[in-house]
Amino acid sequence: IWELKKDVYVVELDWYPDAPGEMVVLTCDTPEEDGITWTLDQSSEVLGSGKTLTIQVKEFGDAGQYTCHKGGEVLSHSLLLLHKKEDGIWSTDILKDQKEPKNKTFLRCEAKNYSGRFTCWWLTTISTDLTFSVKSSRGSSDPQGVTCGAATLSAERVRGDNKEYEYSVECQEDSACPAAEESLPIEVMVDAVHKLKYENYTSSFFIRDIIKPDPPKNLQLKPLKNSRQVEVSWEYPDTWSTPHSYFSLTFCVQVQGKSKREKKDRVFTDKTSATVICRKNASISVRAQDRYYSSSWSEWASVPCS
């Protein structure tokens, strides 16, 4: 058993049918010694008397808010949550496995640049009685500070007969050095509590591996005289690290016909312009990627040819 926060405790339960459970001793936070009784949640049934209460925690029915009283007055509370292990594996029931980029991916994180700011998100089908707490650091043995905000509900979607809820959090490394080579990964830890169930989820990554630039901005077409060709130009996204001479991007320019089956013409360039043939009803799209490290491509920025 360990303390999650004041008066909230997590009981680690190795569960299997007929498991004996965990013996937990609760102590009433009071100088009083006599006349103390204990109850669970809203029930008036007295579970025991005395300054300490010993319980056997076998299942969620044994978790909840234990209260000690004296003469009708509440003395203190202890909320017991369960962290359940089955077959040697801690439960991961609260969050959905996103399966990208691999199985057992519960947290996904992205950074728009090298400033040390990043966003993580996760999915759940649970709509109520749900709280999250996020902590982060660089390295784990001698951790360096990363400050995370509160997790917020960022999207709701319907998936078949189910509703899915996306939560996200923004974090910022306290003393980020954008140009430095990373040697220690960022660690992100999410505590999830649903009703009386506690679970924790972790992710470990280097900022360079989660970089995904914003799409190029100010995408424009300039027709070339007496030609079907156009000059496409764009700019670095505002959110990308500066100076651009050091934090350079490479770009992919694509001409796509109206039909998805039509052949796509693609050009790769390090410049912020390219000359392409603009077909009728086609569209031109440009996306960006770090020039020197193969992290994710940005989403596409698009304009119609006409």
């Epitope: 049918p17 969620f60 029915g61 089955e86 029931d93 189910n162």
Partner: nanobody, 123 residues
Framework: EVQLVESGGGVVQAGESLRLSCAAS????????MGWFRQAPGTEREFVAT????????YYADSVKGRFTISRDSAKNTVYLQMSSLKPLDTAVYYC????????????????WGQGTQVTVSS
């Protein structure tokens, strides 16, 4: 919302068997732990059995252990309670419930409930 409809109740002799079914509709059945409870006249609702969302773990009340078996068929969105060696003490209305906490024998840990099906065991 999850809707639960129980069926399969009836009148049987002591020592006989009965299989209850609970059909779920609405939100994704596969996300929920499923349980059976029962209530005899003048008594509180009593836990019988529960099965986790994967169908890989079960948990029973001591009073039915070895006689009752809970199972689920995710393809059919149905949970079953196979009851054998029935006793007159098993007479009650049997309720199906869906929740997110496994294992739990406490009724308030379940979010959705069916209307119940009557089981009567005569001696």
């Amino acid at each position: 919302e999850v809707q639960l409809v129980e069926s399969g109740g009836g009148v049987v002799q002591a020592g006989e068997s009965l299989r209850l079914s609970c059909a779920a509709s609405g939100r994704s059945f596969s996300d929920y732990e499923m349980g059976w409870f029962r209530q005899a006249p003048g008594t509180e609702r009593e836990f019988v059995a529960t099965i986790n969302w994967r169908g890989s773990s079960t948990y029973y009340a001591d009073s039915v252990k070895g006689r009752f078996t809970i199972s689920r068929d995710s393809a059919k969105n149905t949970v079953y309670l196979q009851m054998s060696s029935l006793k007159p003490l098993d007479t009650a209305v049997y309720y199906c419930a869906a929740g997110r906490l496994f294992p739990s024998s406490r009724s308030r840990d379940y979010d959705y409930w069916g209307q119940g099906t009557q089981v009567t065991v005569s001696s």
